[in-house]
């Protein structure tokens, strides 16, 4: 029978670490991490890490009992967890009978939005106490709410990941810019900022009709040339406060009728809050 892995949590040091080993298996040949989605009961989905590793093809894998994987996450707070994946059989060959290296994977470490993870793995038995053993590590940064997978998470939807304000902005005259955008039921307060290397104008927008989408319009006084300037729209939603996903547009000249010109180059960018 071919070896498979059975993985379970192991928070402390592995018991083998306390024993003296004359010989130890070699290090891993490769370690990779990618996010995968799994649906959860609430109708939302969670993002998990798919950690896969490749064993070195030599006789030292005959000593291999397990591979231990530890993940440290750094964002607003630090997290640390480890799993030990035991091999169900001893290795009878250095490569898979069908060809290629022995490759295994574990899906289970939860992924938070916009977090840097350090994933380390080593084979067991590992080096003796006070000795450096062969290990491998990779970094993985989870995406924020603008990511094509993450944006459908409930937390991101509440932060406005699916909201398209469809910003249009035009220069009415030398002193004013008219900004139009589609509001969202997620919140009723917005900040419109006009930048041309420096901030040349801004305005708070309060939209009382929070329950439905409407088209809001605001005329903003400016202190410099506004043509080609960037409009940044910052919403204030209950879930993300002042660090919600920001949206951008560009100021063009208003048509003679005074009707704002629709823009194709609307871009979104996250603020300080990358959920």
């Amino acid at each position: 029978r071919e070896p498979t892995v059975q993985c379970g949590s192991e928070t402390g040091p592995s018991p083998e670490w306390m024993l003296q080993h004359d010989l130890i298996p070699g290090d891993l040949r490769d370690l990779r991490v990618e996010p995968v989605t799994t649906s959860v009961a609430t109708g939302d989905y969670s993002i998990l890490m798919n950690v896969s590793w490749v064993l070195r093809a030599d006789a030292s894998i005959r000593l291999l009992k397990a591979t231990k994987i530890c993940v440290t996450g750094k964002s607003n707070f630090q997290s640390y967890s480890c799993v030990r994946c035991n091999y169900t059989e001893a290795f009878q060959t250095q490569t898979r009978p069908s060809g290629g290296k022995w490759t295994f994977s574990y899906i289970g470490f939860p992924v938070e939005l916009n977090t840097v993870y350090f994933i380390g793995a080593h084979n067991i038995p590992n080096a003796n106490m006070n000795e450096d053993g062969p290990s491998m590590s990779v970094n993985f940064t989870s995406p924020g709410c603008l990511d094509h997978i993450m944006k459908y998470k409930k937390k991101c939807v509440k932060a406005g990941s699916l909201w398209d304000p469809n910003i249009t902005a035009c220069k009415k005259n030398e002193e004013t810019v008219e900004v139009n955008f589609t509001t969202t039921p997620l919140g009723n307060r917005y900040m419109a900022l006009i930048q041309h290397s420096t901030i040349i104008g801004f305005s708070q927008v309060f939209e009382p009709h929070q329950k439905k989408q409407t088209r809001a319009s605001v005329v903003i006084p400016v202190t410099g040339d506004s043509e080609g300037a960037t409009v940044q729209l910052t919403p204030y939603f209950p879930t993300c406060g002042s660090d919600c996903i920001r949206h951008k547009g560009t100021v063009v000249l208003c048509p003679q009728t005074g009707v704002p010109f629709p823009l194709d180059n609307n871009k979104s960018k996250p603020g300080g809050w990358l959920p």
Partner: antibody, heavy 118, light 107 residues
Framework: QVQLQQPGAELVRPGASVKLSCKTS????????MNWVKQGGPEQGLEWIG?????????QYNQKFKDKAILTVDKSSSAAYMQLISLTSEDSAVYYC???????????WGQGTLVTVS | DIQMTQSPASLSVSVGETVTITCRAS??????LAWYQQKKGKSPQLLVY???NLADGVPSRFSGSGSGTQYSLKINSLQSEDFGSYYC?????????FGGGTNLEIK
Amino acid sequence: QVQLQQPGAELVRPGASVKLSCKTSGYTFISYWMNWVKQGGPEQGLEWIGRIDPYDSEIQYNQKFKDKAILTVDKSSSAAYMQLISLTSEDSAVYYCARSGGFDWFAYWGQGTLVTVS
Amino acid sequence: DIQMTQSPASLSVSVGETVTITCRASENINSNLAWYQQKKGKSPQLLVYDVTNLADGVPSRFSGSGSGTQYSLKINSLQSEDFGSYYCQHFWRPPYTFGGGTNLEIK
């Protein structure tokens, strides 16, 4: 049955290169590493040059030969190759290809190619 | 690199005798050892792998033993076809190395 076929001999000039072939049959080529071994003379010992995994072309060399030998495979024809470069009289030897077993014992050997640098 | 020291370098024996060839590794190779036989002008042939396992078609008069760093190949009741050179090889981790060889000749 498993067969590894090598040409009998190659005569090359000093400073030139030679590409030795090892045509295989009778087994799944991508399932086993292929090794190359040098034997300097009739009574001389065996030296492991390196090995290649035909599945993904991963190569491991004996440091002594890393600037002398280049290992490749052609999966479509189930053949392994070793190119020897910048040849000198020291490289005159018999070169064997040898297929690994479950681990790297050499279960099957080619007949060997005698390389003469002259 | 692991050094493999084989002894004796040569041996002159008669048909029907028993011989033992030894191989010492410079470090523990965890029983990852093979033995090969080579006849003049021919390629080496696998005799024994994993210290004790006989390769297909190898007569039972051949036997291997050992562990750690010390290994041996025993040939009981030598036959005329057993004469030639014998090599040990470790396959613990690359780079793999062979012993210097033992030349077995008829007395």
